[in-house]
Interface confidence: low
């Protein structure tokens, strides 16, 4: 295949260097990949890629004069699964109608641009799991409510790290099935409001490392399995552990926070029917309390049975009734940061 401006190999077109000032109108409509690198594109015009029904990937990178992406640029492309827009510091405006009807989209990267707002993803309607990778856009300051509704019918991963995010509104993630949310390195982000996850399922993984966040929301952390909050020095307290029912791994800033998990063992799945026998329940409660293992973090009306327990001394097969997990937490308390100094002996008992 040949083209007057772009290099071509097996339906992949690479258009590069300063001679490329607009998207060539004569690119074959059955191209599977288009790459625009180091070009002098100032505007990507409406419908620039219309009719590219086989197109799977678009890359627009290192385009230092690019300022505007118009409406209907990434629209009605049934095979498109990857869009990369990066290193375009003068890109200030992406039309809200730029992304529409992309049923196979799996990866959207927008990094190192000058955009002031998150791209509008409401009309993408992907049928696939989507990784939305928006990072190093220092002029993005706010995440509005409903910012990701309509992105995907499946689950999403949001990498929103290293932007200039200072404020996230309640219901920001409404309508999403959130596998992972990375907000790390937004150095001026101070607050996750209480209802930030209202209407969302998840997150399963949350990273708030190197932010100024001082507290986690009271609601919406029921599915959280992994929490990363390294160098998050303002985060002085965690929610009660009952709000973190799914937590398996925590990577925190202060060793003292790991003390909360030291003696907290969590039941992770349905127990075998034999475990419901009242005789077993009584024996277990007795054994755990006698050995000082009832967690003071449990609610008053909650038995150690429902919190997880050690069956070592009972006659039952404890594997059936001991489906519990310890939360893996770091940094671990040590001789210089002992739990006793922070929490005292009583709470540990």
């Amino acid at each position: 295949c040949h083209h007057r401006i772009c290099h071509c190999s097996n339906r992949v077109f690479l258009c590069q260097e300063s001679k490329v000032t607009e998207i060539p109108s004569d690119l074959p409509r059955n191209a599977i990949e288009l790459r625009f690198v180091l070009t002098k594109l100032r505007v990507i015009q409406k419908g620039a890629f219309s009719g590219f029904g086989d197109l799977e990937k678009i890359e627009i990178s290192q385009n230092d004069v690019l300022e505007v992406i118009e409406a209907d640029v990434f629209s009605n492309l049934p095979k498109l699964h990857e869009i990369r827009i990066e290193k375009a510091n003068n890109l200030l405006y992406i039309n809200p109608e730029a992304f529409q009807n992309l049923p196979n989209l799996q990866y959207l990267l927008i990094s190192n641009t000058g955009i002031k707002h998150l791209p509008d993803v409401h009309k993408i309607h992907s049928l696939q799991k989507v990784l939305l990778d928006i990072q190093d856009n220092i002029n993005i300051h706010t995440i509005e409510r409903n910012s990701f509704v309509g992105l995907s019918f499946e689950s999403v991963i949001l990498w929103l790290n290293k932007n200039g995010i200072q404020e996230i509104h309640n219901c920001a993630f409404n309508g999403t099935q959130l596998d992972e949310l990375n907000l790390s390195d937004n150095n001026n982000l101070e607050e996750l409001p209480n209802d930030v996850f209202h209407g969302a399922s998840g997150p399963v993984i949350l990273d708030i490392s190197r932010t100024r966040i001082h507290s986690l929301p009271s609601y919406g952390l029921e599915n959280l399995k992994k929490l990363r909050a390294r160098s998050t020095y303002n985060l002085k307290k965690l929610p009660t552990l009952e709000k973190l029912v799914a937590l398996m791994e925590a990577s925190l800033t202060y060793p003292s926070h790991c003390c909360a998990f030291a003696n907290w063992r969590r039941q992770i799945s349905e127990l075998h029917p034999i475990c419901n026998k009242s005789i077993l329940r009584q024996e277990v409660d007795y054994m755990t309390q006698a050995r000082g293992q009832r967690s003071s973090l449990a609610e008053d009306n909650e038995s150690s049975y429902s919190r997880g327990f050690d069956m070592t001394y009972t006659e039952f097969d404890y594997d059936l009734c001991n489906e519990v997990v310890d939360v893996t937490c770091s940094p671990k308390p040590d001789a210089f940061n002992p739990c006793e100094d922070i929490m005292g002996y009583n709470i540990l008992r």
Partner: antibody, heavy 116, light 108 residues
Framework: QVQLQQPGAELVKPGASVNLSCKAS????????MHWVKQRPGQGREWIGE????????NYNEKFKSKATLTVDKSSSTAYMQLSSLTSEDSAVYCC?????????WGQGTLVTVSA | QIVLTQSPVIMSASPGEKVTLTCSAS???????LYWYQQKPGSSSKLWIY???NLASGVPARFSGSGSGTSYSLTISSMEAEDAASYFC?????????FGGGTKLEIK
């Protein structure tokens, strides 16, 4: 020239499975998605799904997700569709097709008859 | 999913007559992804018109296509015997791709 070759017919018993083949020639097999379409007399055509021979990635019509499984064998440039738990409703002509902008090629289709 | 309804289901036309086949969509379809195919008995389907109005390779110039949104048509300016066949429309503007039921065009 581009050709998609399919066996003419398959007779299968209810509850059984059948594996339909579609041998491609005349083009680079891994450069184009392969589609499968069901055609029943008087009921029009229904898109079953598609597979990317390069990486095996598939998309299915929700209606056929538990009925059809698409695979490819790159070494022989052949696409396959397995239909499981067959009933009389699955009796139809099944066509493979290479659909692309400005170019489309269809196999003749395999007539699947489900009968005891 | 988008339902495509073709009309008429069967029609006859005399040689030289102008013929119009229509394809109506239940919701809007991008014109880039509206296709027409021709099928004759014992043969596989052939792409006839793509992206609403572009004739596929080898299709006679008497054929044309037009439309937008929910309404599309295929027109034969002057019917010839070899045009007798079934024609069906197809969209993959949105998933799953769907097909019209077809129009059987006969020669009088």
């Amino acid at each position: 020239q581009v050709q998609l070759q399919q066996p003419g017919a398959e007779l299968v018993k209810p509850g059984a499975s059948v594996n339909l083949s579609c041998k491609a020639s005349g083009y680079t097999f891994t450069s184009y998605w392969m589609h499968w379409v069901k055609q029943r007399p008087g009921q029009g055509r229904e898109w079953i799904g598609e597979i990317n021979p390069r990486n095996g990635r598939t998309n299915y019509n929700e209606k056929f997700k538990s009925k059809a499984t698409l695979t490819v064998d790159k070494s022989s440039s052949t696409a396959y569709m397995q239909l499981s738990s067959l009933t009389s409703e699955d009796s139809a002509v099944y066509c493979c097709a290479r659909l692309s902008v400005g170019f489309a090629y269809w196999g003749q289709g395999t007539l699947v008859t489900v009968s005891a | 999913q988008i339902v495509l309804t073709q009309s008429p289901v069967i029609m006859s036309a005399s040689p030289g007559e102008k013929v119009t086949l229509t394809c109506s969509a239940s919701s809007s379809v991008s014109s880039s992804y509206l296709y027409w195919y021709q099928q004759k008995p014992g043969s596989s389907s052939k792409l006839w018109i793509y992206s609403t109005s572009n004739l596929a390779s080898g299709v006679p110039a008497r054929f044309s296509g037009s439309g937008s949104g929910t309404s599309y048509s295929l027109t034969i300016s002057s019917m010839e015997a070899e045009d007798a066949a079934s024609y069906f429309c197809h969209q993959w503007s949105s998933y799953p791709p769907t097909f019209g039921g077809g129009t059987k065009l006969e020669i009088k």
